[in-house]
Interface confidence: low
């Protein structure tokens, strides 16, 4: 290899060992029979050398630095060349560095030809290995503006007082042009201005200078976004830290087209603007930091540009002013991440503060709109707490568990509406009475409605799930001992049409000791499937549940269990089942941990099924599934 650097070129070439590898055989630069591990070539020098190994790219890197002095004479503006040409250099990982020094009053602009640049964060790398590291200067201090890959939106970076640009090319990369030019500008009176151009939908992630370290004290940095007028931009902060300010306040300022309040000033912790039409600027302003404990200011944010949606002009009023202890969250439904660009999907409060999720609380009227290409990407989850603290006041009081119509009119699918029903311990219990009798969801007879009620204990230490219930069955009411959550979960958009079928009333009733009592009034036409709570995990220890099964006078009920044995193994206590005729009080008792389950039995009158668990050994849980079928009586036994 021969490298010759013209006199006065202000270029220095340095070949040095790269990151040490675990290769057994060392490699050297061979020059005049001397074996060396570092070679420096200065302006006006010509050096011939070779390497002592076949793959020097595994051992060495090359740095080519050109110093450009704009202080003492005219500046060589225009397209920047790769000197020496890459074809003359050994195939090593190479870094071209341009160090431009200029007066404080002179602005310098780096202009990037297409493809534009994309900023990357710490720990990220560029797919093709080509990186652009750009830094500026404040007096003698170097400030990292950022590291960039190709294929992005950054078209220009303006700085003053000096620029250092490092272009890193992997040894195998064929690139032979710098891809940028330098121009002079008037003073920008700030650290830097980064211009980001969007030609269509897309996103850009950008960071404050020195990220993830601290932004320089009391500095100002601006991003200019060029956005086609027919598109909309939204800003969201991905990560930020605030320093400890002694004077002034850290803030971001927006110049937004059409705003009467430019600049719009936001704190970093505020929700940032969304749904902006056309070009806008964002500036980050630091403060005077506390000398003793400065902390750090850092910001990483994303700008998302997309087509405005039809919904973005519609305002929806959600009136929760008469509600208590309720929160409504609109959020993205979980989806697999896609590699290609997906337009953002935002919900906006008062049309301006947009975010991917929004929680509205009771006690106020809220105006919301949507900035989203496909509203099926969002869903709603609502939580409402109905609590009784004074048993004398609540006893026999009833509440209707209905989804308010305001919520049903929103253009977003309701996923869950959860009512948390809280009662004073050992004082009151609860009864749920549906508008339409309920069916318990089982594998044998699954629910196929557009919604179900999921009933579970709301006591933190208690793992008790009563089951999933949908309209169109035989369960007339469900009584529960203590706090529960009832969740209306929707399964299909057709819920909007079937909403009239929802309707559940909860009443506070005198306390009873059983965990749950199901009142079942079977219809003659169908088989009723019932199963013990906590089907997959087993009925909790020492828990008792009952089914009150009504048998009409002209019918006979067949009670069938779907296993020969319960399968429960008790560690302490006994698990048993009592089947009791309500009229005669005659009862049969079965030891579930010892006996076989009863064969199908016929009942001519209403009867109880009571199941009480022991403390089972782990893995040997109590799960029972049974059915009740009515058939007409052939002989009158009364």
């Amino acid at each position: 290899f021969e490298i010759a650097l013209p006199r006065e070129s202000n270029i220095t070439v340095l070949i040095k060992l790269g990151t040490p590898t675990l290769l057994a055989k060392p490699c050297y630069i061979v020059i005049s029979k001397r074996h060396i591990t570092m070679l420096s070539i200065k302006s006006g020098e010509r050096i011939v050398f070779t390497f002592s190994c076949q793959s020097p790219e595994n051992h060495f890197v090359i740095e080519i630095q050109k110093n450009i002095d704009c202080m003492s004479g005219p500046c060589p503006f225009g397209e920047v060349q790769l000197q020496p040409s890459t074809s003359l250099l050994p195939t090593l990982n190479r870094t071209f560095i341009w160090d431009v020094k200029a007066h404080k009053s002179i602005g310098l602009e780096l202009q990037f030809s297409i493809p534009r640049l994309r900023q990357i964060g710490p720990g990220e790398s560029c797919p093709d290995g080509v990186t652009h590291s750009i830094s500026g200067r404040i007096d003698a201090t170097v400030v990292r503006i950022g590291t960039f890959c190709s294929n992005g939106t950054v078209s220009r970076i303006k700085m003053q007082e000096g620029v250092k640009m490092a272009l890193h090319l992997p040894w195998f990369h064929p690139r032979n042009v710098s891809g940028f030019s330098i121009a002079n500008r008037s003073s920008i009176k700030r650290l830097c201005i980064i211009e980001s151009v969007f030609e269509g939908e897309g996103s850009a992630t950008l960071m404050s200078a020195n990220y993830p370290e601290g932004f320089p004290e009391d500095e100002l940095m601006t991003w200019q976004f060029v956005v086609p007028a027919h598109l909309r931009a939204s800003v969201s902060f991905l990560n930020f830290n605030l320093s400890n300010c002694e004077r002034k306040e850290e803030r971001v300022e927006y110049y937004i087209p059409g705003s009467t309040t430019n600049p719009e000033v936001f704190k970093l912790e505020d929700k940032q603007p969304g749904n902006m039409a056309g070009n806008f600027n964002l500036s980050l302003q630091g403060c005077d930091q506390d000398a003793q404990s400065p902390g750090i200011l850092r910001l990483q944010f994303q700008v998302l540009v997309q087509h405005p949606q039809n919904e973005s002009n519609k305002i929806y009023v959600v009136d929760l002013s008469n509600e208590r202890a309720m929160s409504l969250t609109i959020e993205p439904r979980p989806v697999k991440q896609s590699r290609k660009f997906v337009p953002g999907c935002f919900v906006c409060l008062e049309s301006r503060t947009c975010s991917s999720n929004l929680t509205l609380t009771s006690g106020s009227k809220h105006k919301i709109s949507f900035l989203c290409d496909d509203l099926t990407r969002l869903w709603m989850n609502v939580e409402k707490t109905i609590s009784c603290t004074d048993h004398r006041y609540c006893q026999r009081k009833s509440y209707s568990l209905q989804v308010p119509s305001d919520i049903l009119h929103l253009p977003v699918e309701l996923h869950d509406f959860s009512w948390k029903l809280l009662v004073p311990k050992d004082r009151l219990s609860l009864v749920l009475v549906p508008a339409q009798k309920l069916q318990q969801h089982t594998h044998e007879k699954p629910c196929n409605t557009s919604f179900s009620y999921l009933v579970a204990s709301a006591i933190p230490s208690q793992d008790l799930y009563f089951g999933s219930f949908c309209p169109g069955g035989s369960i007339k009411q469900i009584q529960v001992k203590q706090n529960i959550s009832v969740t209306l979960r929707t399964f299909a958009p057709s819920f909007q049409q079937e909403a009239s079928r929802q309707g559940l009333t909860v009443s506070f009733i005198p306390y009873f000791k059983e965990e749950g009592v199901f009142t079942v009034t079977p219809d003659t036409k169908s088989k009723v499937y019932l199963r013990t709570p906590n089907w997959d995990r087993g009925l909790p220890s020492l828990t008792s549940v009952s089914w009150n099964i009504s048998v009409p006078r002209d019918q006979v009920a067949c009670l069938t269990f779907f296993k020969e044995r319960s399968g429960v193994v008790c560690q302490t206590g006994r698990a048993f089942m009592i089947i009791q005729e309500q009229r005669t009080r005659a009862e049969e008792i079965f030891s579930l941990d010892e006996d076989v389950l009863p064969k199908p039995s016929f009942h001519h009158h209403s009867f109880w099924v009571n199941i009480s668990n022991c403390s089972p050994t782990s893995g040997k849980q109590l799960d029972l599934l049974f059915s009740v079928t009515l058939t007409p009586r052939t002989v009158d036994l009364t």
């Epitope: 710490p122 993830p212 750090i296 933190p460």
Partner: antibody, heavy 119, light 107 residues
């Protein structure tokens, strides 16, 4: 001012259970995560895990899965640590400490609860 | 799991001397490292967060430095009340781990 006040020392027999409480005051319990740290006599600090005070969801370090349960009662601004089937090696001071879910340094600590397990 | 190794295990100094405590992580943890002080019979106290960020109410003689896998806690001039055990803590990823501690004792 922010305070975390823990329940008093406990002397237990092997196989028994213990429940340590940590009452938070001076701030809203649900605004910060609650972490539990163990320190055996003469030993260093061991992070046991944390509980999300908004959702009640606990996260346990591997060595503390099984017999250790974190819980909350937000109505009385209290976090709890329950240890079942106690062993002699559970003898230690247990600390609760306030953290931030995305910023996990512990800026306030309880005074510690000594649990002694001895037959 | 990130293992933190503190050195020295014990540091014997006289009041007024400079103390330098080291904490090394088994892998790079950026600046997700915090320092605590613990005196006998007391709870730990947060001294430094994020490797170098100071905490209000902590004397200015305590400072932290480092990034990646090597970190240092410096006490510019040790006061009598500084004799205690010092722990570093990684907050990089679950599980959060502590170093084994460095005991600063009076010479």
């Amino acid at each position: 001012q922010v305070q975390l006040v823990q329940s008093g020392s406990e002397l237990k027999k092997p196989g028994a259970s213990v429940k340590v409480s940590c009452k938070a005051s001076g701030y809203t319990l649900t605004d910060f995560s609650m972490h539990w740290v163990r320190q055996a006599p003469g030993q260093g600090l061991e992070w046991m895990g944390w509980i999300n005070t908004e959702t009640g969801a606990p996260t346990y370090a591997d060595d503390f899965k099984g017999r250790f349960v974190f819980s909350l009662d937000t109505s009385v601004s209290t976090a709890y640590l329950q240890i079942s089937s106690l062993k002699a090696e559970d003898t230690a001071v247990y600390y609760c400490s306030r953290g931030r879910d995305y910023d996990p340094h512990f800026d306030y600590w309880g005074q510690g609860t000594l649990v002694t397990v001895s037959s | 799991e990130i293992v933190l190794t503190q050195s020295p295990a014990t540091l014997s100094l006289s009041p007024g001397e400079r103390a330098t405590l080291s904490c090394r992580a088994s892998q790079s943890i950026s600046d997700f490292l915090h320092w605590y002080q613990q005196k006998p019979g007391q709870s730990p106290r947060l001294l430094i967060k994020y490797a170098s960020q100071s905490i209000s109410g902590i004397p200015a003689r305590f400072s932290g430095s480092g990034s990646g896998s090597d970190f240092t806690l410096t006490i510019s001039s040790v006061e009598p009340e500084d004799f205690a055990v010092y722990y570093c803590q990684s907050a990089h990823s679950f599980p959060y781990t502590f170093g084994q501690g460095t005991k600063l004792e009076i010479k």
